[in-house]
């Protein structure tokens, strides 16, 4: 028997420095977790102790903090090189700055293979990108070889900016011939490494003949066997075992997100490359693991140029940006309108001639808007200003919901109106009218939504049975502020871009902003 140790990360999202327990900015260092310096310490410990170790990443290193805003992926290549990753799969966020923003900083600079079997380049891009990412890679590990085959969410064109010269094929259809090719090369130990979410990971384990292990990402899935060490609730045991269509037991793993855990899976293979046993658990990277001093010093020197960024002007406002709780928790506020407009603008994807855009709606809990911005400071808006408005380090995500779920969400928005509670929704691409004289649960008297399958966008009444795409904070997607119905009833959830980054990019693009209160949220006569 031959034993392999798979160390894995996914959805690190620019958390190069250690973070607090909830993966936001580290405040009390003695309680902080993750970060590449701490990750390196643990990886090195394991490399020294065990003979056959692979360090893999399942995508979405890009996007999430000011590190990515400034360094645009060069930081990913540099620190992944320093940690000596063995392979990485492309995630959807790796395309956030277009194909060029992937090629230059990462693909050309990475000293490890970057993989995806279901992304095919065409046109002029085909020769430009040739060899910079691969469908699979055969890695020597000790005296053996291991095949790693990559995959990426086929929804990427709706979630990021891959352009028109990359085709995202069905994962299973694309993976099978590559695995077959590995078999003909006498590679009998094959890991599928990719970024399509836990449901697809399980399908790959079930359907793709010859895949021995699946290491996934995208859905931020936390798996654990035994008592979990932090706040994350396991979605199943680690590894999650799938019985394949040809009767094999295939371990599937994922390691939550944000570099908080290091996935640790030990696989035993027989001489024919069959998995005999698999066991392990994610390792919580808490402060009991010291940060490696040389990587930490490297992080500190990269930081020198970051500190100045937050005080630089992104653009100007010529109006007061009312982000006060007195406004945003009671009525339409122009800060809410600005943020929602930025959220929609960040998700413009012209992928189908029938649709002007794939999504037109935004909802945003008023309690998530934490500060106004005064225009009397020469109109200047800085990252620092936006960090006061959106201090929680969240993301603006894409969900699919039925109309009936949206209706429940808007009822929840005003179910205890008047108490300055955070669930009051700010909106974009939605016109809502409330009648507060009616009883809670029956206060939404009009709910019109902006069409997407139209050449001239207009507002139509919400249909209860129709499925709608909505952009919203991850906080709401996870049921925050009592929006349990969103968490329970959502049909799809894809994590998006860092909240501040979305708004700062929009302001930089617009240069001068003047958001108004324009009647998106109304109260019927006599009730307000």
């Amino acid at each position: 028997a031959w034993e392999l140790t798979i160390l894995h990360t996914n959805d690190v999202h620019s958390r190069l420095e250690q973070t607090s327990e909830d993966s936001s900015k580290c405040v009390n260092a003695s309680r902080c977790m993750g970060g590449v310096a701490r990750l390196f310490t643990k990886v090195q410990q394991i490399r020294r102790a065990e003979p056959n170790v692979l360090l893999l990443d399942a995508g979405d290193q890009y996007q999430g903090t000011i590190w990515f805003t400034v360094y645009k992926g060069a930081e990913v290549a540099h620190f992944m090189n320093a940690l000596r990753y063995d392979a990485m799969a492309l995630g959807n966020h790796e395309f956030d700055n277009g194909v060029e923003g992937l090629i230059e900083p990462l693909l050309k600079e990475a000293k490890f293979p970057i993989l995806s079997a279901n992304i095919k380049a065409k046109g002029p891009l085909a020769s430009q990108i040739s060899g910079l990412y691969l469908p699979y890679k055969v890695l020597p590990v000790g005296d053996e070889v291991v095949g790693i085959v990559g995959y990426t969410s086929k929804e990427t064109p709706f979630l990021s900016n891959p352009g028109t010269n990359l085709v995202f094929e069905d994962e299973i259809t694309a993976l099978q011939p590559e695995v077959d090719k590995l078999k003909t090369l006498n590679v009998n130990k094959i890991i599928a490494l990719g970024h399509s979410g836990f449901e697809m990971d399980k399908l790959i384990a079930q359907k793709v003949r010859g895949v021995d292990v699946v290491v996934g990402g995208h859905s931020n899935t936390f798996l654990y066997t035994g008592n979990p060490p932090s706040k994350e609730v396991p979605a199943g045991k680690y590894p999650f075992i799938v019985t394949s269509d040809d009767g094999r037991k295939v371990p599937v793993v994922q390691a939550y997100a944000f570099g908080k855990y290091l996935g640790y899976l030990k696989i035993e293979f027989d001489e024919r490359g069959n998995v005999i046993s698999s066991h392990g658990n994610p390792i919580l990277l808490n402060s009991s693991i010291p940060e490696d001093p040389s990587i930490k010093a490297d992080i500190n020197k990269w930081r020198i140029k970051l500190d100045n960024y937050s005080t630089q002007e992104l653009g100007k406002t010529i109006v007061y940006l009312d982000g006060s709780s007195q406004s945003c928790r009671f009525r339409e506020c122009n800060m809410g309108n600005l943020i929602c407009d930025a959220m929609i603008n960040n998700n413009l994807r012209h992928t189908d001639e029938m649709f002007w855009n794939h999504v037109s709606m935004c909802i945003l809990n008023g309690g998530g808007i934490r500060s106004p911005i005064d225009e009397r400071n020469n109109g200047t808006i800085t990252w620092e200003n936006l960090a006061a408005v959106l201090p929680f380090g969240g993301t603006f995500d894409l969900v699919q919901l039925k109309g009936s779920t949206l209706k429940k969400a808007f009822e929840h928005s005003v179910h205890r109106y008047g108490q300055s509670t955070g669930e009051f929704l700010q909106v974009g691409g939605i016109h809502v009218v409330y009648d507060l004289s009616r009883k809670p649960g029956d206060r939404v008297v009009k709910l019109d939504v902006l069409c997407t399958k139209c050449r001239v966008p207009s507002y139509d009444p919400l249909k209860m049975d129709e499925v709608y795409k909505v952009i919203l904070p991850n906080f709401l997607a996870n049921g925050g502020d009592g929006f349990q119905m969103i968490k329970d009833e959502l049909l799809r959830h894809d994590s998006g871009d860092q909240d501040i980054n979305v708004v700062s990019t929009y302001i930089s693009k617009m240069k001068v902003i003047y958001p108004a209160v324009e009647g998106r949220i109304k109260f019927s006569t006599g009730s307000h």
């Epitope: 400034v70 230059e104 010093a297 140029k305």
Partner: antibody, heavy 120, light 111 residues
Framework: QVQLVQSGAEVEKPGASVKVSCKAS????????ITWVRQAPGQGLEWMGD????????NYNEKFKTRVTITADKSTSTAYMELSSLRSEDTAVYYC???????????????WGQGTLVTV | AIQLTQSPSSLSASVGDRVTITCRAS??????????MHWYQQKPGQAPRLLIY???NLESGVPSRFSGSGSGTDFTFTISSLEAEDAATYYC?????????FGQGTKVEIK
């Protein structure tokens, strides 16, 4: 090999603007900061500011902040420094330099352009 | 901004002499095991050339007679055995925080 090639000498009138270019080759332009440094005749070196071409992020010396604009064109691997409201004391050689700071040199200026003399 | 003061402002020495230049920073420029001080040589009519980075690291292709030392606020640049081609002005520069600044320079002449 790494090269930074700057535009030629300029003569400008007081109150005018000047834009100096710096074409980079031999390395990944988007992954390293480009700095602008000036040197008045017989004087020392003065750090004006820098740009990270990958993101367009800039830092400026307060002394020049209202008058200098540093930009970069990724498509041509060229950085630019524009100085406005020129006065006679802006007569100097203007240098662009590549910072090595993302690996070992830590923002030390490891490659320099040949310099551009601006006479006001 | 951090001020850098070089001394002497000029010196004259013979070929083969040991030459030492100091650079004092108005604030600590060392952190996390790194000292963010660099040294450059500039000859008349030429662009500056990086000699030493991070206080003591010799840039590739630079002769070993050049060296640097120091940490915190006090740094030293040394030419162990002066050669005729070393006649130039030498500058220190810090990169600890923005704005990065240079010392005023030390002119080295050959007697």
């Amino acid at each position: 090999q790494v090269q930074l090639v700057q535009s030629g000498a300029e003569v400008e009138k007081p109150g005018a603007s000047v834009k100096v270019s710096c074409k980079a080759s031999g390395y990944t332009f988007t992954s390293y900061w480009i700095t602008w440094v000036r040197q008045a005749p017989g004087q020392g070196l003065e750090w004006m500011g820098d740009i990270y071409p990958g993101s367009g992020n800039t830092n400026y010396n307060e002394k020049f902040k209202t008058r200098v604009t540093i930009t970069a064109d990724k498509s041509t691997s060229t950085a630019y420094m524009e100085l406005s409201s020129l006065r006679s004391e802006d007569t100097a050689v203007y240098y662009c330099a590549k910072e090595g700071g993302l690996t070992t040199e830590d923002y030390a200026l490891d490659y320099w352009g040949q310099g551009t003399l601006v006479t006001v | 901004a951090i001020q850098l003061t070089q001394s002497p402002s000029s010196l004259s020495a013979s070929v083969g002499d040991r030459v030492t230049i100091t650079c004092r920073a108005s604030k600590n420029v060392s952190t996390s095991g790194y000292s963010y001080m660099h040294w450059y040589q500039q000859k008349p009519g030429q662009a500056p050339r990086l000699l030493i980075y991070l206080a003591s690291n010799l840039e590739s292709g630079v002769p070993s007679r050049f060296s640097g030392s120091g940490s915190g606020t006090d740094f030293t640049f040394t030419i162990s055995s002066l050669e005729a081609e070393d006649a130039a002005t030498y500058y220190c520069q810090h990169s600890r925080e923005l704005p990065f600044t240079f010392g005023q320079g030390t002119k080295v002449e050959i007697k």
